[in-house]
Interface confidence: low
């Protein structure tokens, strides 16, 4: 008997209160199917029902967490039904408070190098899940290390490529509620750098300014970068601007920093809209120093 294929859209990780579409596809083209849930709480809306093409399930509660299979109608089978499909595990998030997700040594990772993603919580989670935005396959399951202050897991990811870069979130769960997940951690953008040639970074009116004076940093390149990213050493996050084509054939973005009070080392990167987590090599560092201020970074 041909097994149908069961899938979940937009994915298998669903926030409490949201909806998920379960789609059962038969290679023989039959579009009627039944759904069953193997574990977790029973879901009465599945009982003795025939679905056509897909089933919109929700708003989901922890009761919907569990393993689903479908059987498609199959007139040539003695029972009238196909063999059960592949299992799809629906995980419901928002049951516990969110963990924290960090990258060591940082979220900007050179192409080919390794980054450690650390998910931690003051809740004693025995399992963690790591999920990349836009990926429909099951999240990565990781065993947590329990300690008096809570729990954590370290995941070594690499060698870094554009395929591994993206927006990551982690979730925690406890063994006796394996498909009921915490709220997601705050998103962490893991970026692969060093894929393209470095842009140039300059300062107007210059890299040394009076305290309170306006300064603008210009990032430019002859590469067709859509976006430039400006980062300051020892600071999380970055400024992001769309590149503009200049008369001289360079693609440039101007970052007005406004009246500056503290200096620092700045770098900029270029990237393309189509690959937002894949950046160029960093520009040479530009030290901006502020005079008339006791603090020089």
């Amino acid at each position: 008997q041909d097994k149908p294929f069961l899938s979940a859209w937009p994915g298998t990780v669903v926030s409490e209160g949201q909806h998920v579409t379960l789609q059962c596809r038969s290679r023989l083209g039959f579009n009627e199917f039944s759904l069953s849930k193997e574990d977790g709480m029973p879901v009465p809306e599945l009982y003795n029902r025939i679905f056509r093409n897909s089933f919109l399930m929700g708003p989901v509660t922890p009761a919907h967490a569990g393993t689903y299979r479908c059987c498609s109608s199959h007139p040539h089978s003695p029972t009238g039904w196909s063999a059960p499909s592949n299992p799809v595990v629906i995980m419901v998030t928002g049951v516990h408070r969110k963990p924290s997700l960090l990258a060591h040594p940082g979220p900007l990772v050179k192409s080919g190098e390794t980054v450690i993603l650390q998910c931690w919580s003051d809740v004693r989670f025995e399992r963690f899940l790591l999920h990349r935005e836009g990926i429909t396959e099951d999240p990565l399951r990781l065993v947590g290390q329990l300690h008096d202050a809570g729990s954590q897991v370290n995941y070594s990811m690499g060698p870094m490529t554009p395929a591994l870069a993206g927006t990551y979130r982690c979730f925690g769960s406890v063994t006796h509620l394996p498909y009921e997940l915490s709220a997601p951690s705050d998103p962490l953008d893991i970026v692969v750098v060093g894929l393209y040639g470095k842009p140039s970074l300059s300062a107007q009116p210059g890299p040394t300014v009076q305290a309170g004076e306006n300064v603008t940093l210009s990032c430019s390149s002859r590469s067709l970068f859509d976006i430039y990213h400006l980062s300051r050493e020892a600071e999380a996050g970055e400024l992001r601007l769309t590149a503009v084509l200049r008369v001289n054939g360079t693609f440039q973005a101007n970052f007005p920093l406004g009246p500056v009070t503290h200096g620092g080392n700045y770098r900029c990167f270029g990237s393309f809209r189509a690959l937002p987590h894949a950046w160029s090599d960093p520009s040479d560092p530009l030290p901006v120093s502020v005079t008339g201020n006791s603090r020089h970074l």
Partner: antibody, heavy 121, light 107 residues
């Protein structure tokens, strides 16, 4: 249907060890926590810890740490609880209890019939 | 460790009475609480989990309520087979702890 069948009563001397078994049937053994709970005569219930047979992960009540060992034999779907350095206050009925009323979900769903362990010189 | 204080420790009631047993947690356990019934010489039986969800096959005269630190088990109309000892259990974190029990006796 789910069944948890425990080994028979034991009489032990102080300082000895006891190993109680709990044979499971009627469900996927490796998918559910098995907890151990004890009850001294005329007293309340006390949680000792659990084992997750899927990966042999354990979590023990600190009160019993160093004295209790929980193991699982997946070939026979049996969980064992061994308690060492027995003293008279360990005299109790020992229960195994499977987690999750609906799947691996919540609290304790199914209980063994209990095993009386008597510690006496 | 989280302490579970159950009250009363015993009560006398008649068939048909409405019976209420309370359990108080020493800190917030959200709704991670179960109620059990135990008869002499028998293993406990789960009645309610996640504070208010009734186990399949348990009569609807049993109900649970509460969240956070204060929880209640109610038997709306006591039946002869309900005379037993009742325990609460929290499973919000390790170690799990039980309440001291409430013995429901015939008046």
């Amino acid at each position: 249907q789910v069944q948890l069948v425990q080994s028979g009563a034991e009489v032990k001397k102080p300082g000895a060890s006891v190993k109680v078994s709990c044979k499971a049937s009627g469900y996927t053994f490796t998918s559910y926590n098995m907890h151990w709970v004890r009850q001294a005569p005329g007293q309340g219930l006390e949680w000792m810890g659990y084992i997750f047979p899927g990966d042999a992960g354990t979590n023990y009540n600190q009160k019993f740490k160093g004295r209790v060992t929980m193991t699982a034999d997946t070939s026979t779907s049996t969980v064992y609880m061994e308690l060492s350095s027995l003293r008279s206050e360990d005299t109790a009925v020992y229960y195994c209890a499977r987690s999750g009323y609906y799947g691996n979900y919540e609290g304790f769903a199914y209980w063994g019939q209990g095993t009386l362990v008597t510690v006496s010189s | 460790d989280i302490q579970m204080t159950q009250s009363p420790s015993s009560l006398s009631a008649s068939v048909g009475d409405r019976v209420t047993i309370t359990c108080k947690a020493s800190q917030d356990i959200q709704s991670y609480l179960s109620w059990f019934q135990q008869k002499p010489g028998k293993a406990p039986k789960t009645l309610i989990y996640r504070a208010n969800r009734l186990v399949d096959g348990v009569p609807s005269r049993f109900s649970g309520s509460g969240s956070g630190t204060d929880f209640t088990l109610t038997i709306s109309s006591l039946q002869p087979e309900d005379f037993a000892t009742y325990y609460c259990l929290h499973y919000a974190e390790f170690p799990y702890t039980f309440g001291g029990g409430t013995k429901v006796e015939i008046k």
